[in-house]
């Protein structure tokens, strides 16, 4: 359950944290998983355990493997696994995918690139930064604490950024590098033909007679403020207001903005005390903006009583 991938380059320092947390006062035992042999805590060893941290100073390709950490808390022991891979140094500038940390996105307003894993190390400023292996120079680039700030970000600032720093352990210095991709987001808003997120077209929803049910119509229309964006439900092609059934009510549309920045609108159709005749109706989710109209249809079906029992 608690396994974490870690990687590094030969002849560089690598420090790995136990994937199971605990207070700093708790004893953590580290083992080579394959042999169950305990990892020493003495700092004179090239590979040694230091509480929640496992240190390779420096790392060798042969260190690759799975390491077990057991956190000894006052109640129960907790086990984690660190899957460590040490790679040979690349002869050329190209950084392979398997050495890349998570991609970060920036924009004109926010262009911080954090140096991955740096908080595990004993380092001192300043960090060195490289883009596609070239040292970054010029007033647009500011190395600040553990991150790089780029002024007036442009689309061609996208690329692979490497931070390089020195880890100090008992007076000995070890080099560490870490690379991640940076992409540039365009913050301009736009409008597009509606995309209905829910329901799926020609979906069938199982309901129980006598119970209440809700149908959500959710559609997205682009990014940023939209001039026109509407969602609504229709019954058999008629507006809800034209359908004289007080059990069936449509909520007012709710604006939503998702993590991907899309401007979306939701409306919920509430059906109280579902009746047999409701199963015969066609429920249409309509999404409309200046680009046009999109319709998804959903029907209701009776929940299978055998399924319900199980």
């Amino acid at each position: 359950k608690f396994s974490k991938q870690s990687w590094g380059l030969e002849n560089e320092a690598l420090i790995v944290r136990c994937p199971r947390q605990g207070k700093s006062s708790y004893i953590v035992d580290w083992y080579y998983s394959q042999t169950n042999k305990s990892i020493p805590t003495q700092e004179r060893n090239r590979v040694f355990a230091s509480g929640q941290l496992l240190k390779f100073l420096p790392a060798e390709v042969a260190d690759s493997g799975i390491y077990t950490c057991i956190v000894r808390s006052p109640t129960f022991n907790r086990t984690g696994y660190a899957n460590v891979t040490i790679y040979k140094k690349q002869p050329d500038c190209n950084v392979p995918d398997y050495l890349m940390y998570s991609t970060v996105s920036g924009s004109e307003k926010n262009s911080k690139i954090y140096c991955p894993t740096i908080d595990l190390y004993n380092w001192t400023a300043p960090l060195e930064w490289f883009k596609n292996c070239q040292a970054l120079q010029g007033s647009r680039y500011k190395a600040h604490k553990s991150f790089l700030v780029i002024d007036n970000v442009m689309t061609d600032d996208a690329g692979d950024y490497t931070c390089k720093f020195i880890h100090n352990e008992n007076g000995a210095n070890y080099s560490v590098t870490a690379t991640r991709s940076f992409t540039v987001k365009d913050e301009q808003g736009f409008s597009r033909f509606p995309v209905i997120r829910a329901p799926a077209h020609n979906e069938t929803k199982e309901v129980e007679i006598g119970e209440n049910t809700n149908l959500t119509c959710s559609a997205c229309f682009g990014k940023g403020a939209q001039f026109l964006a509407a969602v609504q439900w229709q019954l058999n092609g008629n507006k809800i207001t034209d359908f004289s059934e007080p059990r069936i009510q449509q909520e007012e549309g709710q604006n939503q903005s998702f993590s991907d920045g899309l401007a979306c609108v939701n409306t919920v159709l509430r059906i109280a005390d579902v009746k047999e005749e409701d199963l015969l109706l066609r429920y249409d989710c309509l999404a409309l903006n200046l680009h046009g109209l999109r319709r998804h249809t959903i029907r209701l079906s009776r929940k299978n009583p055998i399924d319900h029992q199980s």
Partner: antibody, heavy 121, light 107 residues
Framework: EVQLVQSGAEVKKPGESLKISCKGS????????IGWVRQMPGKGLEWMGI????????RFSPSFQGQVTISADKSITTAYLQWSSLKASDTAMYYC??????????????WGQGTTVTVSS | DIQMTQSPSSLSASVGDRVTITCQAS??????LNWYQQKPGKAPKLLIY???NLETGVPSRFSGSGSGTDFTFTISSLQPEDIATYYC?????????FGGGTKVEIK
């Protein structure tokens, strides 16, 4: 399938003794702590204590220390909770729950169905 | 004993609503906190362990966060089958202790 099956409901008089059981199956019974949780009528959950069937090591909540005995018989993969002298205030639902191994733990991940104990004169 | 204070003690929300329950420990418990769901007449069920890890088979609408003394449990979109009482529980120290529970109802 990993499961804990508890003994049936009990109706007792104050002062009587009682032993309820919890049988584990589908996993290595001796490698996991088994504990007991009390739920009085309409109330929340209270942790009572645990036993490690591998070596019969036990831990108790101070509230229940000396009030109950927790034991296990690994030959029949069963844990027990017992009272030597019941009180009306022991009326409750009692659940057994698995508490992880000697080296790993992820919460109380498997529960018995519960045993209702009613103590009334 | 470590006291676990859960709030609110009960709440009523509509289907589709986001529901948040908080749990506060009387001392630092790192991330040693679990969340359970108990439906009426049933045994409790583990939903989240170590503050934020979803137990296998539990729907992704359930989530947990927090560390130290303050923890949060969230149901991103309440479903009718989520009607239950939810408990937090610390396992940093013996005795293990539970919060008082939060009863979740549908409006």
């Amino acid at each position: 399938e990993v499961q804990l099956v508890q003994s049936g409901a009990e109706v007792k008089k104050p002062g009587e003794s009682l032993k309820i059981s919890c049988k584990g199956s589908g996993y290595s019974f001796t490698n996991y702590w088994i504990g007991w949780v009390r739920q009085m009528p309409g109330k929340g959950l209270e942790w009572m204590g645990i036993i490690y069937p591998g070596n019969s090591d036990t831990r108790f909540s101070p509230s229940f220390q000396g009030q109950v005995t927790i034991s296990a018989d690994k030959s029949i993969t069963t844990a027990y909770l017992q009272w030597s002298s019941l009180k009306a205030s022991d009326t409750a639902m009692y659940y057994c729950a698995r508490h992880g191994t000697s080296s790993d733990y992820y919460g109380l991940d498997v529960w018995g169905q519960g045993t209702t104990v009613t103590v009334s004169s | 004993d470590i006291q676990m204070t859960q709030s609110p003690s009960s709440l009523s929300a509509s289907v589709g609503d986001r529901v948040t329950i908080t749990c506060q420990a009387s001392q630092d418990i790192s991330n040693y906190l679990n969340w359970y769901q108990q439906k009426p007449g049933k045994a409790p069920k583990l939903l989240i362990y170590d503050a934020s890890n979803l137990e296998t088979g539990v729907p992704s609408r359930f989530s947990g966060s927090g560390s130290g003394t303050d923890f949060t449990f969230t149901i991103s979109s309440l479903q009718p089958e989520d009607i239950a009482t939810y408990y937090c529980q610390q396992d940093d120290n013996f005795p293990l202790t539970f919060g008082g529970g939060t009863k979740v109802e549908i409006k």
